[in-house]
Protein backbone atom coordinates (compact mmCIF):
# COMPACT_ATOMS: atom_id res chain seq x y z
CA UNK A 1 0.00 0.00 0.00
CA UNK A 2 0.95 3.32 -0.47
CA UNK A 3 0.45 6.85 0.63
CA UNK A 4 -1.04 9.83 -2.22
CA UNK A 5 -1.63 13.49 -1.66
CA UNK A 6 -5.06 14.50 -1.13
CA UNK A 7 -6.59 17.85 -1.07
CA UNK A 8 -10.01 19.82 0.23
CA UNK A 9 -11.26 22.85 1.41
CA UNK A 10 -10.54 24.10 5.13
CA UNK A 11 -13.96 25.17 5.58
CA UNK A 12 -17.68 25.30 4.05
CA UNK A 13 -20.65 27.06 5.19
CA UNK A 14 -24.28 24.28 4.23
CA UNK A 15 -26.70 26.46 2.43
CA UNK A 16 -30.21 27.35 3.98
CA UNK A 17 -31.66 24.37 2.55
CA UNK A 18 -28.75 21.80 4.33
CA UNK A 19 -26.47 21.55 1.04
CA UNK A 20 -22.44 21.64 1.11
CA UNK A 21 -20.48 20.88 -1.73
CA UNK A 22 -16.51 21.04 -2.11
CA UNK A 23 -13.84 19.54 -4.37
CA UNK A 24 -11.78 16.84 -3.11
CA UNK A 25 -8.72 16.55 -5.64
CA UNK A 26 -6.26 13.67 -5.42
CA UNK A 27 -2.52 13.44 -6.80
CA UNK A 28 -2.92 10.09 -8.57
CA UNK A 29 0.13 8.99 -9.32
CA UNK A 30 -0.19 6.53 -12.39
CA UNK A 31 -3.10 5.71 -14.29
CA UNK A 32 -5.68 4.57 -12.35
CA UNK A 33 -8.78 2.83 -13.54
CA UNK A 34 -10.98 2.24 -10.73
CA UNK A 35 -11.18 4.94 -7.43
CA UNK A 36 -12.97 4.57 -4.41
CA UNK A 37 -14.25 7.66 -2.53
CA UNK A 38 -15.81 7.83 0.94
CA UNK A 39 -16.45 10.37 3.11
CA UNK A 40 -16.02 10.26 6.51
CA UNK A 41 -17.24 12.65 9.12
CA UNK A 42 -14.99 13.30 11.74
CA UNK A 43 -17.14 14.05 15.30
CA UNK A 44 -17.12 13.30 19.23
CA UNK A 45 -13.74 11.40 19.15
CA UNK A 46 -15.94 9.50 16.66
CA UNK A 47 -15.48 8.87 12.47
CA UNK A 48 -18.80 7.46 10.27
CA UNK A 49 -18.56 6.93 7.06
CA UNK A 50 -20.69 9.03 5.02
CA UNK A 51 -20.94 7.69 1.90
CA UNK A 52 -19.17 5.70 -0.58
CA UNK A 53 -18.85 5.65 -4.35
CA UNK A 54 -16.55 3.10 -6.49
CA UNK A 55 -16.20 4.38 -10.25
CA UNK A 56 -14.23 4.07 -13.43
CA UNK A 57 -12.28 6.93 -14.98
CA UNK A 58 -14.23 8.60 -17.76
CA UNK A 59 -17.19 7.85 -16.03
CA UNK A 60 -19.69 9.15 -13.67
CA UNK A 61 -19.71 8.82 -9.46
CA UNK A 62 -22.53 6.64 -8.60
CA UNK A 63 -23.82 6.68 -4.79
CA UNK A 64 -26.32 4.10 -3.79
CA UNK A 65 -30.26 5.53 -4.13
CA UNK A 66 -30.30 6.64 -0.56
CA UNK A 67 -27.22 8.34 -0.03
CA UNK A 68 -26.99 11.48 1.23
CA UNK A 69 -24.06 12.13 -1.32
CA UNK A 70 -24.27 12.84 -4.87
CA UNK A 71 -20.58 13.44 -6.86
CA UNK A 72 -19.29 13.79 -10.51
CA UNK A 73 -15.56 13.43 -11.30
CA UNK A 74 -13.24 14.89 -13.59
CA UNK A 75 -9.92 13.75 -14.10
CA UNK A 76 -8.40 13.12 -10.46
CA UNK A 77 -10.59 15.72 -9.19
CA UNK A 78 -14.05 14.69 -7.29
CA UNK A 79 -17.10 17.24 -6.86
CA UNK A 80 -19.00 16.29 -3.83
CA UNK A 81 -22.49 16.85 -2.69
CA UNK A 82 -23.87 16.13 0.85
CA UNK A 83 -27.35 16.55 1.25
CA UNK A 84 -29.56 17.16 4.09
CA UNK A 85 -27.56 18.63 6.76
CA UNK A 86 -28.98 19.53 9.98
CA UNK A 87 -27.10 21.71 12.75
CA UNK A 88 -26.11 18.64 14.44
CA UNK A 89 -24.43 17.24 11.49
CA UNK A 90 -21.78 20.31 11.85
CA UNK A 91 -17.99 18.16 11.52
CA UNK A 92 -15.34 17.59 10.13
CA UNK A 93 -15.76 15.70 6.69
CA UNK A 94 -13.15 13.56 5.35
CA UNK A 95 -12.21 12.52 1.74
CA UNK A 96 -10.37 9.12 1.48
CA UNK A 97 -9.20 8.12 -1.96
CA UNK A 98 -8.30 4.65 -2.93
CA UNK A 99 -6.67 3.38 -6.89
CA UNK A 100 -7.90 0.59 -6.25
CA UNK A 101 -6.84 -0.64 -9.57
CA UNK A 102 -4.64 -1.15 -11.59
CA UNK A 103 -2.19 -2.73 -9.00
CA UNK A 104 0.20 -1.06 -6.33
CA UNK A 105 -2.99 0.08 -4.14
CA UNK A 106 -2.96 3.67 -3.19
CA UNK A 107 -4.33 5.81 -0.36
CA UNK A 108 -4.90 9.26 0.14
CA UNK A 109 -6.81 11.18 3.07
CA UNK A 110 -7.43 14.23 2.89
CA UNK A 111 -7.38 16.75 6.00
CA UNK A 112 -10.54 17.37 6.15
CA UNK A 113 -13.36 19.93 5.37
CA UNK A 114 -15.06 21.37 8.17
CA UNK A 115 -18.93 22.11 7.47
CA UNK A 116 -20.72 23.88 9.22
CA UNK A 117 -24.55 23.59 9.31
CA UNK A 118 -27.00 26.44 10.64
CA UNK A 119 -30.59 25.43 10.90
CA UNK A 120 -32.94 28.35 9.41
CA UNK A 121 -34.81 30.01 11.66
CA UNK A 122 -38.74 29.67 10.74
CA UNK A 123 -40.11 32.31 9.11
CA UNK A 124 -42.95 34.28 11.75
CA UNK A 125 -45.98 34.01 11.92
CA UNK A 126 -47.40 37.05 9.37
CA UNK A 127 -51.00 38.85 8.46
CA UNK A 128 -50.79 38.37 5.11
CA UNK B 1 -18.35 7.43 25.38
CA UNK B 2 -15.26 5.48 24.22
CA UNK B 3 -13.91 2.38 27.02
CA UNK B 4 -11.09 0.38 25.98
CA UNK B 5 -10.53 -3.34 27.18
CA UNK B 6 -8.00 -5.71 26.91
CA UNK B 7 -8.03 -9.29 27.30
CA UNK B 8 -6.10 -12.47 26.62
CA UNK B 9 -3.63 -12.09 29.12
CA UNK B 10 -2.46 -14.87 31.66
CA UNK B 11 0.25 -17.40 32.84
CA UNK B 12 2.77 -18.87 29.78
CA UNK B 13 6.38 -20.54 29.72
CA UNK B 14 9.32 -18.93 28.06
CA UNK B 15 8.95 -19.42 24.65
CA UNK B 16 5.28 -19.23 24.54
CA UNK B 17 2.49 -17.32 23.05
CA UNK B 18 -0.47 -14.86 23.90
CA UNK B 19 -2.74 -12.86 22.08
CA UNK B 20 -4.02 -9.82 23.51
CA UNK B 21 -7.03 -7.92 22.41
CA UNK B 22 -8.30 -4.25 22.83
CA UNK B 23 -11.90 -3.86 22.29
CA UNK B 24 -13.71 -0.87 22.36
CA UNK B 25 -17.06 -0.46 24.18
CA UNK B 26 -19.25 2.69 23.32
CA UNK B 27 -18.00 3.56 19.91
CA UNK B 28 -15.40 2.23 17.33
CA UNK B 29 -11.34 2.33 17.12
CA UNK B 30 -12.08 3.45 13.48
CA UNK B 31 -9.46 5.63 12.46
CA UNK B 32 -7.48 5.71 16.41
CA UNK B 33 -4.22 5.64 16.83
CA UNK B 34 -3.69 2.38 19.27
CA UNK B 35 -0.86 1.64 21.44
CA UNK B 36 0.09 -1.01 23.75
CA UNK B 37 2.46 -0.42 26.91
CA UNK B 38 3.59 -2.41 30.05
CA UNK B 39 4.59 -1.76 33.22
CA UNK B 40 7.14 -4.33 34.89
CA UNK B 41 6.84 -4.61 38.70
CA UNK B 42 8.93 -1.69 39.90
CA UNK B 43 10.35 -0.30 36.79
CA UNK B 44 8.05 2.76 34.63
CA UNK B 45 5.46 2.29 31.84
CA UNK B 46 6.78 1.71 28.33
CA UNK B 47 5.15 1.66 25.25
CA UNK B 48 5.59 -1.71 23.55
CA UNK B 49 3.73 -1.05 20.08
CA UNK B 50 1.33 1.72 18.53
CA UNK B 51 -0.37 1.10 15.35
CA UNK B 52 -1.51 3.92 12.41
CA UNK B 53 -5.23 5.30 12.45
CA UNK B 54 -5.15 3.85 9.01
CA UNK B 55 -3.19 0.58 9.90
CA UNK B 56 -0.16 1.25 7.60
CA UNK B 57 2.74 2.26 9.90
CA UNK B 58 3.55 0.07 13.11
CA UNK B 59 6.26 0.94 15.79
CA UNK B 60 8.37 -1.23 17.65
CA UNK B 61 10.35 -1.05 21.23
CA UNK B 62 13.70 -2.68 20.26
CA UNK B 63 12.79 -5.25 22.88
CA UNK B 64 10.11 -6.86 21.39
CA UNK B 65 10.76 -6.42 17.28
CA UNK B 66 11.12 -9.74 15.81
CA UNK B 67 8.51 -11.06 18.68
CA UNK B 68 5.79 -8.76 18.45
CA UNK B 69 3.19 -7.99 15.88
CA UNK B 70 0.43 -4.79 15.90
CA UNK B 71 -3.12 -5.05 13.70
CA UNK B 72 -6.08 -4.06 13.21
CA UNK B 73 -9.30 -6.07 12.77
CA UNK B 74 -11.56 -2.93 11.96
CA UNK B 75 -15.00 -5.43 11.43
CA UNK B 76 -14.36 -6.95 14.96
CA UNK B 77 -13.36 -3.00 16.28
CA UNK B 78 -10.16 -4.34 18.12
CA UNK B 79 -6.67 -4.39 17.83
CA UNK B 80 -4.21 -7.74 18.34
CA UNK B 81 -1.16 -7.40 19.81
CA UNK B 82 0.45 -11.04 18.72
CA UNK B 83 3.19 -11.67 21.40
CA UNK B 84 5.44 -14.96 20.22
CA UNK B 85 8.86 -16.24 21.70
CA UNK B 86 7.98 -14.54 25.46
CA UNK B 87 10.63 -14.06 28.06
CA UNK B 88 10.56 -13.28 31.67
CA UNK B 89 11.17 -10.29 31.11
CA UNK B 90 7.90 -9.48 29.30
CA UNK B 91 6.28 -10.17 32.46
CA UNK B 92 3.93 -7.34 33.28
CA UNK B 93 0.46 -5.01 33.22
CA UNK B 94 -0.26 -4.62 29.62
CA UNK B 95 -2.42 -1.64 28.87
CA UNK B 96 -4.14 -0.58 25.87
CA UNK B 97 -4.10 3.31 24.87
CA UNK B 98 -6.11 5.02 22.11
CA UNK B 99 -6.22 8.45 20.58
CA UNK B 100 -8.45 9.55 17.68
CA UNK B 101 -5.57 12.28 16.01
CA UNK B 102 -6.72 14.96 13.01
CA UNK B 103 -6.82 13.08 9.68
CA UNK B 104 -3.78 14.36 8.46
CA UNK B 105 -1.89 12.54 11.44
CA UNK B 106 -4.15 9.17 10.67
CA UNK B 107 -1.11 7.84 8.90
CA UNK B 108 1.67 8.30 12.31
CA UNK B 109 0.99 7.06 15.75
CA UNK B 110 0.08 9.19 18.65
CA UNK B 111 2.82 11.15 20.62
CA UNK B 112 0.25 11.00 24.10
CA UNK B 113 -2.78 9.48 24.48
CA UNK B 114 -6.40 10.41 25.63
CA UNK B 115 -7.88 6.66 26.87
CA UNK B 116 -6.39 3.76 28.64
CA UNK B 117 -7.73 0.48 29.28
CA UNK B 118 -7.91 -1.00 32.50
CA UNK B 119 -5.13 -3.56 31.85
CA UNK B 120 -4.37 -7.22 31.01
CA UNK B 121 -1.57 -9.27 33.71
CA UNK B 122 0.72 -11.35 31.35
CA UNK B 123 3.35 -13.06 33.18
CA UNK B 124 5.83 -15.22 31.49
CA UNK B 125 7.32 -18.09 34.04
CA UNK B 126 8.30 -21.74 33.93
Known amino acids: CKAMHVAQPAVVLASSRGIASFVCEYASPGKATEVRVTVLRQADSQVTEVCAATYMMGNELTFLDDSICTGTSSGNQVNLTIQGLRAMDTGLYICKVELMYPPPYYLGIGNGTQIYVIDPEPCPDSDF | EVQLVESGGGLVQPGGSLRLSCEAS????????IGWFRQAPGKEREEVSCISGTGLRTNYADSVKGRFTISRDNSKNTVILQMNSLRAEDTGVYYC???????????????????WGQGTQVTVSS
Open chain 2, 97 to 115: TGKLLHPSLWSACANEYDL
Open chain 2, 26 to 33: GGTLDYWS
